[in-house]
């Protein structure tokens, strides 16, 4: 498909042209952010970013890869390196102790230098490191922390718990020994390291004792309660603030968003992680988008400003699973709720990153035509006469022998939400890839970010434009509009 | 391993703040560039880049990742959109026209608008598009490409031709009908087309007639000319200029690099494309570094500055043929040719630009340990309890069944420089990939280099930052030492 | 021009050793792949081993019948190639043959060879 | 390992005959294969690489052909001095030879 308009040079050059004037227009902003928000796509390399940009391209009815992002529109672009200090292909926790709190750690650690061990609890004490949302609470703004997945998940546990393992998300998970050694599960960390005003996503399950039934799957034992220290974690959270209020469901997160009552928010829609955005039961459960504006909503009440951490956490689900439809589908929701936020804050005064913590081995390949699904086949048959997908997997489930022979596949198999992409090696789980991440940034000293940078940089680089900890004599005007 | 200074906190705390100072004394320049060059890493996308950075650091006994690439010190970052008019997966023709001419075209055409057609000479007229490098040419500087790949290739003819089919090479390739209709191959444009003064690279069997013995392979038939209309194209070359030189080995390029009498150089090393560094005769061939050297010493006596294009042209062969290792060595020199070259030049006058044309299906996951070979093996086995390597492709000849099955691989295998890693699906050639490519930038109007931008921003900015057409209007102050 | 020239070759008794050596000129020894083979008599030609140049760090390849017991390696200074063949048995009886690959259409063709020299184990 | 199966062993034919030499790969060898000629106390020579390209010197008679798993060399025009024994050798993966055909004259 050849778009008439595209075939005429003036069609490019006026197109460029115009680029280049909005490019000679950026204006570095000296002012401090009084707002800081970093949306994290889990799993989102940029292999993902373009073919989700081509899908929500074609879901408008584009032929999409012309079409923007949300996060393509951010006018500052780095390259992150998301190695871990112990591995060349880093997991969620190594690199969410890096983006959150600027220091690299080891391998499937959260919260933690590198001189702790992955499940030596006696490695904890001392090798904390403290997450720019910590210090921004310390600095009297309001935090929140919004999640597809269940909030005790790496990624945003890196902005509030220490844990030299990241499986820890209730004490049921804990060894007794560990306990013992003083160690705490994920969950309690939640409610007991730092006053956290909005907390967002999945994950009621490891707040409450074994036995309690859920309130959505009440007949359901395995979705219920699994603590075995008997704690009511949500309750003792509410008894800590007087305005404090704890839902479960879309409807009563809605409600209390709207609630000038309400000062701090629990919303917990699942036992576990949040459901898929294409099986969300959008009566029970919100979106990523309706729970970043919730949020948003009740922080942007502090004169002092915010932090906010949103994770499309479910992109790297998707890919693990080598079900490419669910991953990019989360991409979609992730962007949309970037959107969202753009339209419910000002660049003046709100510092806003995109980032992934790490990639996936997930490409997108094989010449389609323009304008072809995302999904479907590349043009030509390979090696061995059948059909092959444009998105395929290094590694994964997807890998297939039939009859001691790669299976075909046609373009109604390969568009199926269920389908997994073939794969060179079989894995249970496909894995992480090592290759740098984009990071986009808009608003306050965005400008900052440039170049090719250690993951690290992300953390220091919200904190400096806040003027937190380590950067409180930061030497930023005051930023545009503040009340303080 | 982890290396011990890396478990303080402190480490990577003071890393970032020298980041971020750095990144707060950035200036853009308001000056012009008085030199552009533009590096083109065939087929380096993201993995690319980062899996070379981790050989590279390597081969310096370092545990990888931690190290800069030349490329990774330059300060501004972009991501570049790739496709074709016509496919979501571009080839090097269609990305040439984009990043050389300013304007997309269609798959496998080069410096033509989208509305020539692949192969149907009849589309050619009227839709040719001009390069930066033609333009730069006509406001009085001197012009140069280099290539590992034949000069008559996709990508540097970019700079200077017009083909509905990028393998006319020579006159041999374009069907007689085409050839009759006045359809030039691109061997013939590459010396009539305009004024180039510096041409390095493989590529001289297109410029002989058929039964001209080879000066390297005189015995060998296959590698000597191929051209059917009786022309010896270099013999028409050097006639049109007074000091123009014709080299084919390394010692006489090194010889005329430094002789003043020479103003027009061209030096083709191999009958058709470069061999990969790692099989170069290093006293026949010179490497991609010594040839930028020698074009760089050339074109810089040109007061009013230079315009060069450099390719490490056979990043992409490696790949095509799933092997690695030969893709990522070919990174490395391309990567030693942009240091040189930053040797060589001031940033001050020089504004230099880092991209691919597009990326390839190629990954580098399954958690290695950091230090570990990135030719290496997996921790662990695959689901069919045989090993399997951390670099993968998601299609291409590395694919194999044996005996019905995935075949076992150990690392001494894999790290082979012949060593094809495994593919999901079997094809000849492994293909292209769609996602976005970085584009790295330093210099003059560096800072324009931002966001996610079209491919064509890149050929648009490079004029503007010299005022060059259409941007003669560009309003900079004049570069920094013009002598012009 | 490029030339190869087996030398070292002889009788010698099961069990024992002898080194080959393969001397080249003509052209940059270092930027080569170099190869042993052999044929023994009446059966058809084997490749032995592989030694790299120096772009790829002289690694070292060997077939299934010859690993652990013959080691190739190279002496760039003078441009030798060597075959150690150690615990020699009667089937190694064959003609060894060295060889310089170059890279046509990026693979590794075997464009020169050495005459042979004869290597006969026997008691 | 990969392993070439060369077909026939030996072969008789007559001045003037068309020859074919088969060698079948047991995988992919993406035309990674030469021919060559070997006579009793010489060094084999190479006649064809790259499934098709011919050696200097080597007469136009000798052709190359295949893909994948499967190769041909064909003497167009069988002569006497074409007596030999020819090897097929595929280099995608170190080196493997065939095992040899054995050409001789009716």
């Known amino acids: 498909i050849i778009p008439v308009e595209e075939e005429n040079p003036d069609f490019w050059n006026r197109q460029a042209a115009e680029a280049l004037g909005a490019a000679k227009k950026l204006q570095p902003a000296q002012t401090a952010a009084k707002n800081l928000i970093i949306f994290l796509g889990d799993g989102m390399g940029v292999s993902t970013v373009t073919a989700a940009r081509i899908l929500k391209g074609q879901k408008k009815d584009k032929l999409g890869p012309e079409t923007f992002l949300a996060m393509d529109r951010f006018p500052y672009v780095a390259l992150s390196k998301t190695y871990s200090v112990d591995k060349h292909v880093p997991d969620s926790g190594a690199t969410a102790t890096a983006y959150l709190c600027g220091v690299k750690g080891n391998f499937q650690t959260i919260g933690l230098s590198a001189a702790a061990r992955f499940n030596q609890c006696n490695t904890t004490r001392g090798n904390e490191v403290i997450s720019v949302m910590n210090r921004a609470k310390k600095a009297g703004k309001s935090v929140g922390v919004v999640t597809t997945t269940r909030v005790q998940h790496a990624s945003p546990a890196g902005a509030y718990a220490h844990t030299v393992n990241r499986n820890w998300y209730s004490d049921a998970d804990v060894p007794a020994s560990a306990r013992q050694e003083g160690c705490q599960d994920i969950a309690t960390q939640l409610i007991s390291n730092m006053d956290i005003d909005v907390i967002l996503g999945g994950g009621r399950k490891y707040m409450f004792p074994m036995g309690t039934p859920d309130p959505e799957y009440p007949d359901d034992y395995s979705q219920g309660g699994t603590r075995l220290d008997g704690k009511n974690l949500v309750q003792e959270w509410l008894a800590k603030h007087q305005g404090a209020r704890y839902v479960w469901n879309r409807t009563e997160l809605l409600q209390a968003s709207l609630d000038p009552s309400v000062t701090h928010l629990m919303g917990l829609f699942e036992p576990g992680d949040m459901k898929y955005e294409i099986h969300r039961d959008s009566t029970l459960d919100p979106s990523l988008m309706e729970m970043t504006e919730a949020a948003l909503l009740l922080l942007s009440r502090n004169p002092r400003g915010f932090f906010l951490f949103v994770e499309g956490g479910r992109i790297d689900h998707g890919h693990h699973e080598s079900r490419a439809y669910r991953a990019l589908t989360e991409t979609i929701m992730f962007d949309d709720a970037i959107e969202r936020a753009g339209q419910l804050t000002s660049e003046e005064d709100t510092l806003s990153l995109v980032t992934a913590d790490h990639s996936h081995v997930f490409s997108f390949g094989g010449y389609p035509l323009r304008g072809s699904s995302i999904f479907g086949l590349a043009p030509g048959k390979a090696r061995d006469r059948k059909a092959y997908t444009v998105l395929l997997y290094g590694n994964g489930p997807g890998y297939v022998l039939k009859d001691g022979a790669r299976p075909d596949v046609t373009e109604s198999e390969s568009g199926s939400p269920e389908y997994r992409q073939q794969s060179a090696v079989p894995l249970d789980g496909e894995t992480h890839a090592g290759e740098d991440v984009a990071v986009f940034a808009r608003g306050p000293q965005a400008h900052l970010v440039h170049g090719v940078q250690e993951q690290t940089f992300i953390a220091h680089v919200m904190a400096f434009a806040a003027c937190l900890e380590p950067y409180t004599a930061c030497d930023l005007a005051p930023r545009a509009g503040t009340t303080d | 391993i982890i290396p011990v200074e890396e478990e303080n906190p402190d480490f990577w705390n003071r890393q970032a703040a020298e980041a971020l100072g750095a990144a707060k004394k950035l200036q853009p320049a308001q000056t012009a560039a008085k030199n552009l060059i533009i590096f083109l890493g065939d087929g380096m996308g993201v993995s690319t880049v980062t899996a070379a950075r981790i050989l590279k650091g390597q081969k310096k006994d370092k545990l990888g990742p931690e190290t800069f690439l030349a490329m990774d010190r330059f300060p501004y970052v972009a991501l570049s959109k790739t496709y074709s008019v016509d496919k979501h997966v571009p080839d090097s023709g269609a990305t040439a026209t984009a990043y050389l001419c300013g304007v997309k075209g269609n798959f496998q055409t080069i410096g033509l608008s989208a509305a020539a057609r692949f192969n149907q000479c009849n589309t050619t007229r009227g839709n040719e598009v001009i390069s930066v490098m033609n333009r730069a040419k006509k406001a009085g500087k001197s012009v140069g490409v280099v290539t590992t790949t034949r000069v008559q290739h996709a990508s540097p003819a970019g700079a200077y031709a017009h083909t509905v089919n990028r393998n006319w090479y020579s006159d041999a390739d374009v069907p007689a009908s085409a050839r009759q209709e006045g359809c030039q191959d691109i061997a013939t444009q590459l010396i009539s087309n305009m004024d180039i003064d510096v041409i390095l690279g493989g590529g001289r069997k297109y410029m002989f007639p058929m039964g001209t013995p080879d000066p390297e392979y005189p015995d060998d038939y296959s590698q000597g000319g191929t051209r059917l209309d009786g022309k010896n194209l270099v013999q028409e070359w050097l006639a049109k200029h007074q000091g123009a030189r014709y080299v084919w080995n390394r010692t006489e390029l090194l010889q005329a690099s430094l002789d003043p009498s020479v103003t027009h150089l061209m030096g083709l090393f191999e009958p058709g494309d470069m061999k990969y560094e790692i099989h170069r005769d290093s006293t026949l061939d010179p490497s991609l570094m010594e040839m930028t050297e020698a074009a760089l010493l050339l074109l810089s006596r040109n007061p009013r500055g230079f315009f060069l294009f450099v390719e490490g042209g056979r990043i992409d062969h490696g790949h095509h043929e799933s092997r690695a290792y030969r893709a990522l060595t070919e990174t490395i020199m391309f990567d030693d040719a942009i240091e040189r070259a930053g040797q060589l030049t001031s940033e001050e006058d020089t504004l230099s630009l880092v991209t691919a044309d597009h990326s390839h299906v190629f990954s580098f996951g399954g958690y290695p340990l950091r230090g570990s070979s990135i030719f290496g093996l997996a921790p662990g086995k695959a689901r069919d309890r045989k090993a399997y390597t951390v670099l993968l492709y998601g299609n291409g000849p590395g694919y194999v069944l044996k005996d019905g099955a995935r075949p076992d691989v150990t690392e001494s295998e894999s790290g082979s420089p012949e060593y094809r890693q495994q593919s999901a699906v079997p094809l000849d050639g492994e293909t292209h990939a769609g996602e976005d490519v970085a584009v790295f930038a330093r210099g003059p109007q560096a800072h324009l280099v931002h966001g996610v931008q079209e491919q064509t921003f890149i050929a648009h900015v490079m004029a503007f930052a010299a005022c060059l057409e259409p941007y003669t209007a560009c309003d900079l102050a004049p570069r920094a030492g013009t002598t012009d | 021009e490029v030339q190869l020239v087996e030398s070292g070759g002889g009788l010698v008794q099961p069990g024992r050793s002898l080194r080959l050596s393969c001397t080249a000129s003509g052209f940059t020894f270092t930027d080569y792949y170099m190869s042993w083979f052999r044929q023994a008599p009446g059966k058809g030609l084997e490749w032995l081993a592989l030694i790299r140049n120096k772009a790829t760090g002289y690694t070292t390849e060997y077939s299934a019948s010859v690993k652990g017991r013959f080691t190739i390696s190279r002496d760039n200074s003078k441009s030798i190639l060597y075959l150690q063949m150690n615990s020699l048995k009667t089937e190694d009886t064959a003609v060894y043959y060295c060889a310089r690959a170059s890279f046509y259409y990026d693979g590794k063709v075997l464009a020169y060879w050495g005459q042979g020299t004869l290597v006969t184990v026997s008691s | 390992d990969t392993q070439m199966t060369q077909s026939p062993s030996s072969l008789s034919a007559s001045v003037g005959d068309r020859v074919t030499i088969t060698c079948k790969a047991s995988?992919?060898?993406?035309?990674?294969i030469a021919w060559f000629q070997y006579k009793t106390g010489k060094a084999p020579k190479l006649f064809i690489h790259y499934t098709s390209t011919l050696q200097p010197g080597v007469p136009s008679r000798f052709s190359g052909s295949g893909s994948g798993r499967d190769y041909t060399l064909t003497i167009s025009s069988l002569q006497p001095e074409d007596i030999a024994t020819y090897y097929c050798l595929q280099y995608d993966n170190l080196y493997t030879f065939g095992q040899g055909t054995k050409l001789e004259i009716k």
């Open positions: 995988q992919d060898i993406n035309k990674y």
